[in-house]
C-alpha cells in the first residue's frame, strides 16, 4: 500500500530579483513531483550561506539559469 504523502514544498516566498551567478555557492532546481506540484529553485549564496527561493517564472531568474548552464557547459570537457 503506497504511503499517502501531504504536499511538502519548501518555498514560502519567492524572489523575482536577479542574482549574480558569481555570488552563488549552489543552485538547486527541484522539479515538480507528487510531493510538490511546482518547480522550486533554491539558491545558496556564498556570503553567509544564505538560502533564497527564486521565482522560476521570472525573466531575471530564467536568465540566471541560462548563465549558470552556460558556465557549466564551458567547464565540462
Amino acid at each position: 500500500v503506497p504511503l499517502s504523502r501531504t504536499v511538502r514544498c519548501t518555498c514560502i516566498s519567492i524572489s523575482n530579483q536577479p542574482v549574480n551567478p558569481r555570488s552563488l555557492e549552489k543552485l538547486e532546481i527541484i522539479p515538480a513531483s507528487q510531493f510538490c506540484p511546482r518547480v522550486e529553485i533554491i539558491a545558496t549564496m556564498k556570503k553567509k550561506g544564505e538560502k533564497r527561493c527564486l521565482n522560476p517564472e521570472s525573466k531575471a531568474i530564467k536568465n540566471l539559469l541560462k548563465a549558470v548552464s552556460k558556465e557549466r557547459s564551458k567547464r565540462s570537457p
Partner: antibody
Framework: QVQLVESGGGVVRPGRSLRLSCAAS????????MHWVRQAPGKGLEWVAV????????YYADSVKGRFTISRDNSKNTLYLQMNSLRAEDTAIYYC????????????????WGKGTLVTVSS | SSELTQDPAVSVALGQTVRITCQGD??????ASWYQRKPGQAPVLVIY???NRPSGIPDRFSGSSSGNTASLTITGAQAEDEADYYC???????????FGGGTKLTVL
C-alpha cells in the same frame, strides 16, 4: 506604500463562523508568504497560521487546526482566515503579517503588519 | 511543541542599557526575531537573524544569540522604547511558528 488592512471582525456567538480578510497593497502580493497572528485581551502574541505565496503550503497552530482555514486570492491581493466552531478563547485582535525575505527556513520573520481586526466570541 | 520563555517585566533607567532575553530549545537551531508592540499599535519588527535591523530601526537596538538563549539589547534606552517586546522563532521539530510570552519594558 506597503500596507495590510484587516477586516471582517465583530461579535459572534460560540460555535458560529466568521471570515477575516486582509487586503494587501504596495508590494507584489503573489510573491510573499503571509501569516495570521492574534492577541487575546491581556495576553501575548500567538501565531495562528501561515500560507505560501501560491497557497500550496499551509501550516496551523495546534489550537486552531481543523477549525480555521487560511487561504488567499492573488488576483485580488487578499488573504483570508475562515474561522469555524468559534470558542470564547478565540476572542482576540487578529493581525495579518507578511513573511520577510525568501529563505525557506526563515518564514517566521514578519516585516509588515496590519493594524488588526477585533473578533469577540461571546454568548 | 517547544516554547519560548521571556521575563514578564524589565525596567531600565533612561539612557542606560537593558537586555531582554528569550529562552527555548528551538533557538539552538534557528535565530530569533524581535518585535516591539506599543498599546493600540501593530507590532514592529526590530531585529531578525544574527543581528539585522530593518530600515528605520535605530542602531541602539541589537541582537545576539548563545546556545538556547537569544537577547535583545537596547543601548541607551529612550522613553519611546517603553513597550512590550516579543521574540519569535520556529519549532525545530516541526513547522510551527513560536512567540515568547512577551516582556514589558518600563523606562524610568
Amino acid at each position: 506604500q506597503v500596507q495590510l488592512v484587516e477586516s471582517g471582525g465583530g461579535v459572534v456567538r460560540p460555535g458560529r463562523s466568521l471570515r477575516l480578510s486582509c487586503a494587501a497593497s504596495g508590494f507584489t502580493f503573489s510573491s510573499y508568504g503571509m501569516h495570521w497572528v492574534r492577541q487575546a485581551p491581556g495576553k501575548g502574541l500567538e501565531w495562528v497560521a501561515v500560507i505560501s505565496y501560491d497557497g500550496s503550503i499551509k501550516y496551523y497552530a495546534d489550537s486552531v487546526k481543523g477549525r480555521f482555514t487560511i487561504s488567499r486570492d492573488n488576483s485580488k491581493n487578499t488573504l483570508y482566515l475562515q474561522m469555524n466552531s468559534l470558542r470564547a478563547e478565540d476572542t482576540a485582535i487578529y493581525y495579518c503579517a507578511r513573511v520577510m525575505g525568501t529563505d525557506p527556513h526563515s518564514y517566521y520573520y514578519m516585516d509588515v503588519w496590519g493594524k488588526g481586526t477585533l473578533v469577540t466570541v461571546s454568548s | 511543541s517547544s516554547e519560548l520563555t521571556q521575563d514578564p517585566a524589565v525596567s531600565v533607567a533612561l539612557g542606560q542599557t537593558v537586555r531582554i532575553t528569550c529562552q527555548g530549545d528551538s533557538l539552538r537551531s534557528y535565530y530569533a526575531s524581535w518585535y516591539q508592540r506599543k498599546p493600540g499599535q501593530a507590532p514592529v519588527l526590530v531585529i531578525y537573524g544574527k543581528n539585522n535591523r530593518p530600515s528605520g530601526i535605530p542602531d541602539r537596538f541589537s541582537g545576539s544569540s548563545s546556545g538556547n538563549t537569544a537577547s535583545l539589547t537596547i543601548t541607551g534606552a529612550q522613553a519611546e522604547d517603553e513597550a512590550d517586546y516579543y521574540c519569535n522563532s520556529r519549532d525545530s521539530s516541526g513547522n510551527h511558528v513560536l512567540f515568547g510570552g512577551g516582556t514589558k519594558l518600563t523606562v524610568l
